[in-house]
């Protein structure tokens, strides 16, 4: 899913208040529900029919530092006879997800927010066919 | 995927520099790759065999003010007669995400990162449990 | 997490109606499958259906079709079952569960379950 622009609205200070100095905003230290946990599905990665790998990214100046990217291993979809069938296909679910970048110059630290798409996970899709007539 | 714990080092400091004052960070406005886009596949959570609906919430002090989770739509999946098979079944899958929430008192204006459970979509997976006939 | 309270349990009358609710704790609900199990006195527990994270699908046990009835407000974040013409059989302690696999709950190995709420039927 999309993150829609900031536009120039979300970061500001209300117009009746003094602007931001230099173009930075107060962070506060702490992860609201940091603590929350994920918990999905048993190994739905290898028993899904549209099944997918993981990829982990690492970059120790990013927040989070490993970003996980699925990537679908079929064309086709997994049948109950464990082949793949090509008259399905298996589609990629991806998510648009906020990190945060480090800058530092010596003891000068800011962080800065960027916009990353993550593929989450692989679906099985019937497949929209456009249907070419040739006279 | 779930996002590891900050520990207490992503936002501080290197030891050898003054600690950062207040309990807060320099976020610098703007956002990195804002344009960036989601291309998924064309109504993929109606032509899934695991389909799903969206539900939108929307809160004017978080960034992204809108956050989309999906609910799957069937307990089984939908097999090639358009028919609900519970032989399978229709899982969620789950992202964790960051946000920012806003806090405002008068003109002061300071933000937080908060993590949030996010379902982008469903997948169709093969059962684990094999119901055991008891003679 | 997910934490879930029923309510709604107590005693009736044969031949009368009675609607259990499930509050779930925890923001994301409307990822889990949620039902319904029962478990009569020197009985195991019995499944009694089962509905997904939408509310568009309903799995029922076959012997409860008729008289049972299960829905969910995701926006109430809570679970029902709605039961009528109930007979003294009925007699049990009622447990919500919810699961993201369906085929988890539906065999009592479900992730998540409520205390239990009593529900007798006298004739």
């Known amino acids: 899913r999309k993150i829609p622009k900031v536009g120039h609205t979300f970061f500001q200070k209300p117009e009746s208040c003094p602007p931001v100095p230099g173009g930075s905003m107060k962070l506060d230290i702490g992860i609201i529900n940091e603590n929350q946990r994920v918990s999905m599905s048993r190994n739905i990665e290898s028993r899904s029919t549209s099944p997918w790998n993981y990829t982990v990214t690492w970059d120790p100046n990013r927040y989070p530092s490993e970003v996980v990217q699925a990537q679908c291993r079929n064309l086709g979809c997994i049948n109950a006879q464990g082949k793949e069938d090509i008259s399905m296909n298996s589609v990629p679910i991806q998510q648009e997800t906020l990190v945060v970048r480090r800058k530092h110059q010596g003891c000068s630290v800011s962080f800065q927010l960027e916009k990353v798409l993550v593929t989450v996970g692989c679906t099985c899709v019937t497949p929209v066919i456009h249907h070419v007539q040739h006279h | 995927r779930k996002i590891p714990k900050v520990g207490h080092t992503f936002f501080q400091k290197p030891e050898s520099c003054p600690p950062v004052p207040g309990g807060s960070m320099k976020l610098d406005i703007g956002i990195i790759n804002e344009n960036q886009r989601v291309s998924m596949s064309r109504n993929i959570e109606s032509r899934s065999t695991s389909p799903w609906n969206y539900t939108v919430t929307w809160d004017p002090n978080r960034y992204p003010s809108e956050v989309v989770q999906a609910q799957c739509r069937n307990l089984g999946c939908i097999n090639a007669q358009g028919k609900e098979d519970i032989s399978m079944n229709s899982v969620p899958i789950q992202q964790e995400t960051l946000v920012v929430r806003r806090k405002h008192q008068g003109c002061s204006v300071s933000f937080q990162l908060e993590k949030v459970l996010v379902t982008v979509g469903c997948t169709c997976v093969t059962p684990v449990i094999h119901h055991v006939q008891h003679h | 997490e997910v934490q879930l309270v029923e309510s709604g349990g107590g005693l009736v009358q044969a031949g009368g109606s009675l609607r259990l609710s499930c509050a779930a704790s925890g923001r994301t609900f409307s990822s889990y499958v949620v039902g319904w199990f029962r478990q009569a006195p020197g009985k195991e527990r019995e499944f009694i259906g089962a509905?997904?994270?939408?509310?568009?699908?309903?799995y029922y046990a076959v012997s409860e079709k008729d008289r049972f009835t299960i829905s969910r407000d995701n926006g109430k974040n809570t679970l029902y079952l709605q039961m009528s013409s109930l007979k003294a059989e009925d007699t049990a302690v009622y447990y919500c569960?919810?699961?993201?696999?369906?085929?988890?709950?539906?065999?009592?190995?479900?992730?998540?379950w409520g205390q239990g709420t009593q529900v007798t039927v006298s004739s």
């Open positions: 509905i997904s994270g939408s509310g568009d699908s309903i």
């Open positions: 569960t919810a699961d993201q696999e369906f085929g988890y709950l539906r065999f009592g190995r479900s992730e998540y």
